[in-house]
Interface confidence: low
Amino acid sequence: QLLEPCGYIYPEFPVVQRGSNFTAICVLKEACLQHYYVNASYIVWKTNHAAVPREQVTVINRTTSSVTFTDVVLPSVQLTCNILSFGQIEQNVYGVTMLSGFPPDKPTNLTCIVNEGKNMLCQWDPGRETYLETNYTLKSEWATEKFPDCQSKHGTSCMVSYMPTYYVNIEVWVEAENALGKVSSESINFDPVDKVKPTPPYNLSVTNSEELSSILKLSWVSSGLGGLLDLKSDIQYRTKDASTWIQVPLEDTMSPRTSFTVQDLKPFTEYVFRIRSIKDSGKGYWSDWSEEASGTTYEDRPSRPPSFWYKTNPSHGQEYRSVRLIWKALPLSEANGKILDYEVILTQSKSVSQTYTVTGTELTVNLTNDRYVASLAARNKVGKSAAAVLTIPSPHVTAAYSVVNLKAFPKDNLLWVEWTPPPKPVSKYILEWCVLSENAPCVEDWQQEDATVNRTHLRGRLLESKCYQITVTPVFATGPGGSESLKAYLKQAAPARGPTVRTKKVGKNEAVLAWDQIPVDDQNGFIRNYSISYRTSVGKEMVVHVDSSHTEYTLSSLSSDTLYMVRMAAYTDEGGKDGPEFTFTTPKFAQGEIE
């Protein structure tokens, strides 16, 4: 059978507002007082098994004791009333759990959404944490009819159990209630049709146009509550490799539609599209994006001619010369399609032009020593580019006018070249470069720059610590001008090896040292200077610095009949490297001198 408790705590289920004061009382039963020979002064209050200080306790009468707590902050406290029976034995009389928290804040920011094909979901901001069990109930009604309440599981949202009825306004509000209070949000009044989030458009397809290489036509299917809603669209697109989307102006897609032509696109380019929709009034929510669809614009004729240059090979006879015409493949953005071939037309004054169709990017022809004009056009299936024209003068004509103040310097991992234009109008500039090496021929790469350019960077794959010979040639309507060259490094390093020093002549008190320049393959940069270190086996080391233009140096004030150790180092802007150590001995006597 159940044992009767010795007394009770009131209130039995205490809930206190944080920061406020709270008083509980413990009332002992008369039978208990007599059984244990106690009264209320024997009561010991405890919170979480710790005795409450006596100053918080008041004995009201022989059966009743109260305890007062100020500024309650703990979320949950076990409060027990205990008696000291027979002097020292502590008996538990009763226990309660005291909870603390806050009354609910008035819910704010109540918003609702109708995901197409689902019931309405409403969401709100509950305000500050209550720290208590708090029930949130979403209420909704028409002017004439109440809908079933929606009990929130999370306290911040609820999905109603009924299907929405469109084109009739509904009133919605949230009630929040816990042990400390009850509060209602402001109500919102709306037509559920203005809260719809449509399902994404589907079956998005993209087609191109043979007539216009700058457009793609889109078509799609919209749902809009099965045609109940008129939807406007939001269309975004990007090139296949891009990461950012381009926005079609929303004002262009405001009217309900299931197709659209996107303009101002680049020819022969793959684009990816996506589309979303919203009620045409702009009320409600945007749908999620559709699945992406891609399409490629039609080809257009190449937008510019290729870069065009020529090289003259050494001729064996006097009457003919071998000329190699060279050009660069157009980048995709300028080719505007698949380049099928190139058309080269060679014209010699007062003679019929010769036309060549070439699939590669060079053509070698044998020309007489007359002046020629070569033109080059790239062709795709739509048409030909404009022609690049190059005058090949007679070899007897001396090239005049070259660029001045030619400079090269590395910056941001690129090798930059700049110059001052010649005093005569230029058609274009040709930059040529190659790696200088004693072990391999100088294999040239080249690029073309417009007449307005006087600073550019080399666009090939350049290597660090390699010496590049760079040549700039202005090209005029009459043919190439004079060429200017310089050497440059993308990035210097310390030399791969130092100079090997030797003696050219040794006297009693001096020695002439000589060395060879470090091969260009080992220089790794511009050699700025040398250092010569020399010492005897017992003396201290001496160092002299020598300009990089020298290949010999005289050491003076040496001791006679002495072994010297010599080492040389070469320095670039990025550091130095020692060569091997060399030894020599000065003679005891000068030439013709007797002991």
């Epitope: 704010t108 959404i113 305000g127 306290g155 949202s157």
Partner: nanobody
Framework: QVQLQESGGGLVQPGGSLRLSCAAS????????MSWVRQAPGKGLEWVSA????????YYADSVKGRFTISRDNAKNTLYLQLNSLKTEDTAMYCC??????????????????WGPGTQVTVSS
């Protein structure tokens, strides 16, 4: 009880960077989506960025897209916000906010509160 403690704010010049942290306790951090919000002087709360419980999906306000990066370390119960290319209009008190589910629905915008003390970010030359 839920506790959120922001840190990492400070004074920085335009174009500079900061990394804000939010240490969370009192709940199962890895189960909830989290957001960063901010309040500029004299203005209302503005939502900045959100991340789902697993960290696989992130969301940004247009005003910070491409400059701010949200991330989380569920093992350390910590939320982060990396602020790059800061502008004077980014000056605000930044707070982190806990959502009530693991997923964040960007089509639903509702009120946020700063439960923690926040951390002040001042962008000035």
């Amino acid at each position: 009880q839920v506790q959120l403690q922001e840190s990492g704010g400070g004074l920085v010049q335009p174009g500079g960077s900061l990394r804000l942290s939010c240490a969370a306790s009192g709940f199962t951090f890895s189960s909830y989506a989290m957001s960063w919000v901010r309040q500029a002087p004299g203005k209302g709360l503005e939502w900045v960025s959100a991340i789902n419980s697993g960290g696989g999906s992130t969301y940004y306000a247009d005003s910070v897209k491409g400059r701010f990066t949200i991330s989380r370390d569920n093992a350390k119960n910590t939320l982060y916000l990396q602020l790059n290319s800061l502008k004077t209009e980014d000056t605000a008190m930044y707070c982190c906010a806990k959502h009530v589910t693991g997923d964040y629905d960007p089509s639903l915008r509702y009120g946020y509160n700063c439960w923690g003390p926040g951390t002040q970010v001042t962008v000035s030359s």
